[in-house]
């Protein structure tokens, strides 16, 4: 259905962050859910040295957090 | 402001590897919940989504061609790859690289033109 | 994978008209669809996040909306920016899947 040559064009507005107010980032399924479905990761048995399983699930940070900033313990906001 | 640019070969001949490069800005893939990926789209036709790959190098991976792709990034450059081994004359299309966050594909490029032909 | 059943195809319509186009997912995806616009220049655009949200600068004639498996973009009184193409998409899990497009044309 595309035709013709192509054109950048951006948006522009701010990004967005990645999960609305009251929505947080659900590593299992990777994208956004309300924060009263988010599940809690099972205890790591003493001595495992195993990863964190994947479906530990945290709070979204706000985009253009630079490298090595933590995950803020908040949902995301616009 | 967010934006995203493709480059690729253009043109290249059946059983060669594409390898194209989503260059971008206004983002970090070192943020937690962001992703980048890959979707195509033939002449005439619809979108096919590829691969994507997020801030912590989980990789997804269209079942379908999941044996010819591989994506990677380089987080320090703001740039993601997407290789296509053993292309065919199928592989001619736009293929566009996009921003994924929490919503799936916010920001998408503007798409570069690759055309397999001997 | 998750079929995205996209109708209509194509879609006559006249300035001012109140249009809605339509996707069906063949299993579960929540709220968990997107609507985009592709220009004839190949430009894509996310119109709508998570079925039913505006993107920032999207005009407030876009909505979505959903009824049971059916996703709907409505544009209330069409303008003609508008007669171009559009995609929904889901990512309730991967793969993603694209509906196969609807082409709206002015009558």
């Known amino acids: 259905m595309r035709r013709g040559p192509r054109s950048l064009r951006g948006r522009d507005a701010p990004a967005p962050t990645p999960c609305v107010p009251a929505e947080c980032f659900d590593l299992l399924v990777r994208h956004c859910v309300a924060c009263g479905l988010l599940r809690t990761p099972r205890p790591k048995p003493a001595g495992a040295s195993s990863p964190a399983p994947r479906t530990a699930l945290q709070p979204q940070e706000s985009v253009g957090a630079g490298a090595g900033e933590a995950a803020l313990p908040l949902p995301g906001l616009l | 402001q967010v934006s995203l640019k493709e480059s690729g070969p253009g043109i290249l001949q059946p059983s060669q590897t594409l390898s194209l490069t989503c260059s971008f800005s206004?983002?970090?893939?070192?943020?937690?919940?962001?992703?980048g990926g890959w979707v195509r789209q033939p002449s005439g036709k619809g979108l096919e989504w590829l691969a994507h790959?997020?801030?912590?190098?989980?990789?997804y991976y269209n079942p379908a061609l999941k044996s010819r792709l591989t994506i990677s990034k380089d987080t320090s450059k703001n740039q993601v790859f997407l290789q296509i081994a053993n292309v065919d004359t199928a592989d001619t299309a736009t293929y566009y690289c996009?921003?994924?966050?929490?919503?799936?594909?916010?920001?998408w490029g503007q798409g570069t033109s690759v055309t397999v032909s001997s | 994978d998750i079929q995205m059943t996209q109708s209509p195809s194509s879609l006559s319509a006249s300035l001012g008209e109140r249009v809605s186009l339509t996707c069906r997912a063949s299993?579960?995806?929540?709220?968990?669809l997107n609507w985009l616009q592709q220009e004839p220049d190949g430009t894509i655009k996310r119109l709508i996040y998570?079925?039913?949200r505006l993107d920032s600068g999207v005009p407030k004639r876009f909505s979505g909306s959903r009824s049971g498996s059916d996703y709907s973009l409505t544009i209330s009184s069409l303008e003609s920016e508008d007669f171009v193409d559009y995609y929904c998409?889901?990512?309730?899990?991967?793969?993603?899947?694209f509906g196969g497009g609807t082409k709206l044309e002015i009558k």
């Open positions: 996009a921003r994924i966050a929490g919503y799936a594909m916010d920001y």
């Open positions: 206004g983002f970090s893939l070192s943020t937690f919940g962001m992703g």
């Open positions: 790959i997020w801030w912590d190098e989980d990789k």
């Open positions: 299993q579960d995806i929540g709220s968990n």
């Open positions: 998570a079925t039913s």
């Open positions: 998409l889901q990512y309730a899990s991967s793969p993603y899947t």
